[in-house]
């Protein structure tokens, strides 16, 4: 058993049929010594008396808010949550496996630049009695500070018969050094509580590996005289790190016909313009990637050819 | 070339070669096949590789103030990785394909380090840790770890030379 926060405790249980459970001793936070009784949740049934209560925690029915009273007055509370371990593996019932970029991906994180700011998100099908708390650090043995905000519900989607809820959180490294080569990864820890079930999820990454620039901005076409060619120009996204002479991007320009089956013409360039042939009914798209490190491409910015 | 007394390196040449190094480092370690899956243990790690850290003056402001600190750090790293790529870790079993980019990568690391340091002048170089794993799987794992950290190192070096070529070239 360990303390999650004041008066909230997590009991770690091996979860299998007829498991013996864990013996837990609760102590009433009071100078009083006698006349103390204990109850669980809203029930008025007295579970025991005395300053301490010993219980055998085996299942969710044994978890909940234990309260000690004296003469009708509440002295203190202890909320017990359960953390299930099945076949030696902690349960992951609360969050949905996003399966991208690989199986068992519960947390996904992205950064728009090298400022030390990043966003993580996760999915669940649970709509009520759900709380999240997020902590982060750079490195784990001698951790350096990363400050995370509160997790918020950022999207709701209908998937077949189910509703899916996306939560996200923004974090900022306290003393970020955008130009340095990271040697210690960022660690993100999410505590999830659904009713009386506790779970924790972690992710470890370098900012350089989660970089995904915003799409190029101000995408424009300029027809070239007496030619089917056009000059496409664009600018670095506002959110990208500066100066651009240092934090450089490379770009992919694509000409795509109306039909998905039509051959795509692609050009790669480090410049912020390119000359391409504009076919009728086609569109021109541009995306960006860090020039020197192969992290994710941005989403496409697109304009119609016409 | 970076020489004592602080004269400038051939920024544009360094920019071109460092960008080539980035491409080679990624082609030498594509994340594919069963090797992309998981790493087996951490018996032999690459914690001792030189990193370009916050205080090394490799940020735009630090380069403007005095690029020598940063260039020395980059040079140190280039020599370190050049020695690793020439060691038994990469030459032993399992053998690389004959036209593997590792050979070119090795030569390019040497080329860039020579651009930064003329003959007859020696910056301090970092000691290479004595990594000589006995098992082929340990060597293979170590190769991937080295190449992965090299990708990060050369990315920073390439940014430095690109910025230098754009803003510090005579």
């Amino acid at each position: 058993i360990w303390e999650l926060k004041k008066d909230v405790y997590v009991v770690e249980l091996d979860w299998y049929p007829d498991a013996p459970g864990e013996m837990v001793v609760l102590t009433c936070d009071t100078p009083e010594e006698d006349g103390i009784t204990w109850t669980l949740d809203q029930s008025s049934e007295v579970l025991g008396s005395g300053k301490t209560l010993t219980i055998q925690v085996k299942e969710f029915g044994d978890a909940g808010q234990y309260t000690c009273h004296k003469g009708g007055e509440v002295l203190s509370h202890s909320l017990l949550l359960l953390h299930k371990k099945e076949d030696g593996i902690w349960s992951t019932d609360i969050l949905k496996d996003q399966k991208e970029p690989k199986n068992k991906t519960f947390l996904r994180c992205e950064a728009k630049n090298y400022s030390g700011r990043f966003t993580c998100w996760w999915l669940t099908t649970i709509s009520t009695d759900l709380t999240f708390s997020v902590k982060s650090s750079r490195g784990s043995s001698d951790p350096q500070g990363v400050t995370c905000g509160a997790a918020t519900l950022s999207a709701e989607r209908v998937r077949g018969d189910n509703k899916e809820y996306e939560y996200s959180v923004e974090c900022q490294e306290d003393s970020a050094c955008p130009a340095a080569e990271e040697s210690l990864p960022i660690e993100v820890m999410v505590d999830a509580v659904h009713k009386l079930k506790y779970e924790n999820y972690t992710s470890s990454f370098f900012i350089r590996d989660i970089i995904k620039p915003d799409p190029p901005k101000n995408l424009q076409l300029k027809p070239l005289k007496n030619s089917r060619q056009v000059e496409v120009s664009w600018e670095y996204p506002d959110t990208w790190s500066t100066p651009h002479s240092y934090f450089s991007l490379t770009f992919c320009v694509q000409v795509q016909g109306k039909s998905k089956r039509e051959k795509k013409d692609r050009v790669f360039t480090d410049k912020t313009s390119a000359t391409v042939i504009c076919r009728k009914n086609a569109s021109i798209s541009v995306r960006a990637q860090d020039r020197y490190y192969s992290s994710s491409w941005s989403e496409w910015a697109s304009v119609p050819c016409s | 070339r970076a020489v004592p007394g602080g004269s400038s390196p051939a920024w544009t040449q360094c920019q071109q070669l460092s960008q080539k190094l980035c491409t080679l480092a990624w082609s030498a370690h594509p994340l594919v096949g069963h090797m992309d899956l998981r790493e087996e243990g951490d018996e032999e790690t690459t914690n001792d590789v030189p990193h370009i850290q916050c205080g090394d003056g490799c940020d735009p402001q630090g380069l403007r103030d005095n690029s020598q600190f940063c260039l020395q750090r980059i040079h140190q790293g280039l020599i370190f990785y050049e020695k690793l790529l020439g060691s038994d870790i990469f030459t032993g079993e399992p053998s690389l394909l004959p036209d593997s980019p590792v050979g070119q990568l090795h030569a390019s690391l040497l080329g860039l380090s020579q651009l930064l340091q003329p003959e007859g002048h020696h910056w301090e170089t970092q000691q290479i840790p004595s990594l000589s794993p006995s098992q082929p799987w340990q060597r293979l794992l170590l190769r991937f770890k080295i190449l992965r950290s090299l990708q990060a190192f050369v990315a920073v070096a390439a940014r430095v030379f690109a910025h230098g070529a754009a803003t510090l070239s005579p």
Epitope: I89, K104 | P30, R38, E40, P94
Partner: antibody, heavy 118, light 111 residues
């Protein structure tokens, strides 16, 4: 040395699922992938899927996604494969094999012969 | 899925001679640095045994008369000089992408 112990044989009724075991010893069980491979009598080898014991991440051959469920018990260093609704097509030898960075199936168990018969 | 076609299906070789087994992949299983290609030997009633990994590297404890070569789509296993104990079925396997697949096998008979 690395050892993967599998029961020699399992007789199973059609439609009654069967759970095959593979007990690992001689190495750190949570450090590498455990693969499962099928071999029908007198036939070739088919890769079913694999599981990483550290967090139970699985990768399954699409052909077997509705047939095989892979699990592990870290406390006993044992990998399991459950075959659902077995038919005569599932009668085969099933091997577990430890993957390494050099090759995906380096160390093999002796195999369990599953016979599906009424 | 990548299909591996092994040839011949069976092979008879005299003691001391060379046995050559080929395997062709339906698409390249190599990157710029490695070929994700392996050879196994299987004897009746036994599990397969890894002989060659990453196309040309001899697994520890395997006799030096076994050698592997090739890259891209075409790979070869050579055994020279063949010994009695080499009578077995040989399988190729790739691990370039999921799912890993095996060749159909080549049965080697020693005459």
């Amino acid at each position: 040395q690395v050892q993967l112990q599998q029961p020699g044989a399992e007789l199973v009724r059609p439609g009654a699922s069967v759970k095959l075991s593979c007990k690992a010893s001689g190495y750190s069980f949570t450090s590498s992938w455990m693969n499962w491979v099928k071999q029908r009598p007198g036939q070739g080898l088919e890769w079913i899927g694999m599981i990483h014991p550290s967090d139970s991440e699985t990768r399954t051959n699409q052909k077997f996604k509705d047939k095989a469920t892979l699990t592990v018990d870290k406390s006993s260093s044992t990998a399991y494969m459950q075959l659902s609704s077995p038919t005569s097509e599932d009668s085969a030898v099933y091997y577990c094999a430890r993957g390494m960075i050099t090759a995906p199936t380096v160390y093999w168990g002796q195999g369990t012969l599953v016979t599906v018969s009424a | 899925d990548i299909v591996l076609t092994q040839s011949p299906a069976s092979l008879a070789v005299s003691l001391g001679q060379r046995a050559t087994i080929s395997c062709r992949a339906s698409k390249s299983v190599s990157t710029s640095a490695y070929s994700y290609f392996h050879w196994y030997q299987q004897k009746p009633g036994q599990p397969p045994k890894l002989l060659i990994y990453l196309a040309s590297n001899l697994e520890s404890g395997v006799p030096a008369r076994f050698s592997g070569s090739g890259s891209g789509t075409d790979f070869t296993l050579n055994i020279h000089p063949v010994e009695e104990e080499d009578a077995a079925t040989y399988y190729c396997q790739h691990s370039r992408e999921l799912p890993w697949t095996f060749g159909g096998g080549t049965k080697l008979e020693i005459t």
